[in-house]
Interface confidence: low
Amino acid sequence: AGHLEQPQISSTKTLSKTARLECVVSGITISATSVYWYRERPGEVIQFLVSISYDGTVRKESGIPSGKFEVDRIPETSTSTLTIHNVEKQDIATYYCALWEAQQELGKKIKVFGPGTKLIITDKQLDADVSPKPTIFLPSIAETKLQKAGTYLCLLEKFFPDVIKIHWQEKKSNTILGSQEGNTMKTNDTYMKFSWLTVPEKSLDKEHRCIVRHENNKNGVDQEIIFPPIKTDVITMDPKDNCSKDANDTLLLQLTNTSA
Amino acid sequence: AIELVPEHQTVPVSIGVPATLRCSMKGEAIGNYYINWYRKTQGNTMTFIYREKDIYGPGFKDNFQGDIDIAKNLAVLKILAPSERDEGSYYCACDTLGMGGEYTDKLIFGKGTRVTVEPRSQPHTKPSVFVMKNGTNVACLVKEFYPKDIRINLVSSKKITEFDPAIVISPSGKYNAVKLGKYEDSNSVTCSVQHDNKTVHSTDFEVKTDSTDHVKPKETENTKQPSKSCHKPKAIVHTEKVNMMSLTV
């Protein structure tokens, strides 16, 4: 089955610059299929822009200004690129690549879409580092004791642009765990978001990862925030204990920045 | 030019209660086109649901039913038993791929219909309230309540900033919420919740611990012993900005 990946979750540009968006095709030979590009402007319908066929023929939607969009396919890396020249405010949109995928039953086809890349145009001069800054919260002892479960919370702050994806996995597993998240909120010129994961008691002794995808992550790779395992077998109801009384029976986590 | 027009901009649905989305075609006969349905979820993922004739995306056949009403020139998508996973924007789109003659392999989309999912009407449930802290950051976790109306207060005399709460449907079909804030006196912050004309405090749920660690350090990690017998393990946070974390119980 054909699968489309758009590695850039967002692409931030200043006016008049060139944006290059990538789409990686797997599960099907790019040289044997056509790749389509669609645009979804805020509040408008999703619109076909341009396609490139298996033989390299390019077809543009009527009404699209010539010279604005350039589409290419690179068989060597199974990649199609959409180049947007001289970006302007009206180019702000989410851009999707798509292809027709044949179903097992002869003659049946469906069009599958990539996850989209949001083109953001800014005139702001932002701080050098606008990657998401993580703060972690471990389960409260009360929750682990009373509910035989624990909630991890991953707070991400001071990032730009607002496009961010967060998911959770156990340390040595690729299975994505069911989590919940708040809306992305604006704070001054940057954004914040949080996501939380509730796990049953039997999973508390495993390490968990909050995995964050953002355009400005260092080196362009997903940021992994490790949540250490929790020991639950030591919790008692002894009122005389004063070890963590001053911290309201929660864990106080102090994050120290030791990067250069 | 043809246009696809959804019946509603927003459709609230209840978990388990069937719902129907409709999309009419203007300017052409719907029978001349193939109709497709897609769902866009948080994070912009566009997932294929249905295409004539009887083609369903993986995992959709059991819970979705696509149809065409040629007399009314409209497309219909039924969600047979909605769950919280079905929340998102639903799009109808048409093409003429494989119909012979002048055909278009591009999709023409209608505007989306936002489907919001609500829990089924059910007996009222009082929330559990827990506080989680890290430095000046405090989170109030409110679990498993119904109905949705709730007021969450983080009680502090030294507020730096507070954020609007996130309220979401829990996997069990009730609600969960989290409210975050930053406080100079985070150690003394508690959380109180007004729900269903009652007040619930985080302190109602506090338990005492013995003097052993709550976080299990790895074999290879160093642990320092503070004056009380509480472990202070080092945990590695794989991020570019934060790479050392000390835990104090």
Partner: antibody
């Protein structure tokens, strides 16, 4: 500038699995395809396969049943596993970056290679 | 057996022009770009020509590439003794779901 360094055992027994790692330094593994290529002594180059930083792979059909290429973005490295090896798998193994944009799929940066001998 | 065909050896005297040819099929050279690599004994190959005729920075303009139909060639003008090396052509092959294919290599000797 970006440099590649192969590492792994120089001797593997027949029928066992050959495992090599390629560490990318001086740049990010992100947004590129990364390949493994081998060269038996005195012979030409043979392409083994590539991986995209997100995990998508493509393998040489003649080796597909025995090859696994994995990527670890957090460690900025990718790896090769070749199972059920025989003496015919004795070769210098190179890792290489597949160029983007105008470099259109050329292997633009290579590791220095590591010799692997299959012998009991 | 290499998918692309190269003559096993070529030779020339300093200052001469030498051409190395590479022949393929419609599914590789015919529909994709050709790259050339230079390899000295005991070292890793180095990219010499990409996209049929483009030189990476640092490669002297004595080296040029061309492609016609299902064949490609590498020309070296003003041959120098340091050009003595093995030269490989490479392309991608659509019929094999885009794997890389190499020629068998041409050993260039400067007499």
């Amino acid at each position: 500038q970006v440099q590649l360094q192969e590492s792994g055992p120089g001797l593997v027994k027949p029928s066992e699995t050959l495992s090599l790692t390629c560490t990318v330094s001086g740049g990010s593994i992100s947004s590129y395809f990364w390949s493994w290529i081998r060269q038996p002594p005195g012979k030409g180059l043979e392409w083994i396969g590539y991986i995209f930083y997100s995990g998508s792979t493509n393998y040489n059909p003649s080796l597909k049943s025995r090859v696994t290429i994995l990527v670890d973005t957090s460690k900025n490295h990718f790896s090769l596993k070749l199972s059920s090896v025989t003496a015919a798998d004795t070769a210098v193994y190179y890792c290489a970056r597949v160029g983007r944009w105008e470099l259109r799929g050329a292997f633009d940066i290579w590791g220095q290679g590591t010799m692997v001998t299959v012998s009991s | 057996q290499p998918v692309l065909t190269q003559s096993s050896s070529a030779s020339g005297t300093p200052g001469q022009r030498v051409t190395i040819s590479c022949s393929g099929s419609s599914s590789n050279i015919g529909s994709n770009t050709v790259n050339w690599y230079q390899q000295f004994p005991g070292t890793a190959p180095k990219l010499l020509i990409y996209s049929n005729n483009q030189r990476p920075s640092g490669v002297p303009d004595r080296f040029s590439g061309s492609k016609s139909g299902t064949s490609a060639s590498l020309a070296i003008s003003g041959l120098q003794s340091e050009d003595e090396a093995e030269y490989y052509c490479a392309a991608w092959d659509d019929s094999l779901n885009s794997p890389g294919v190499f020629g068998g290599g041409t050993k260039l000797t400067v007499l």
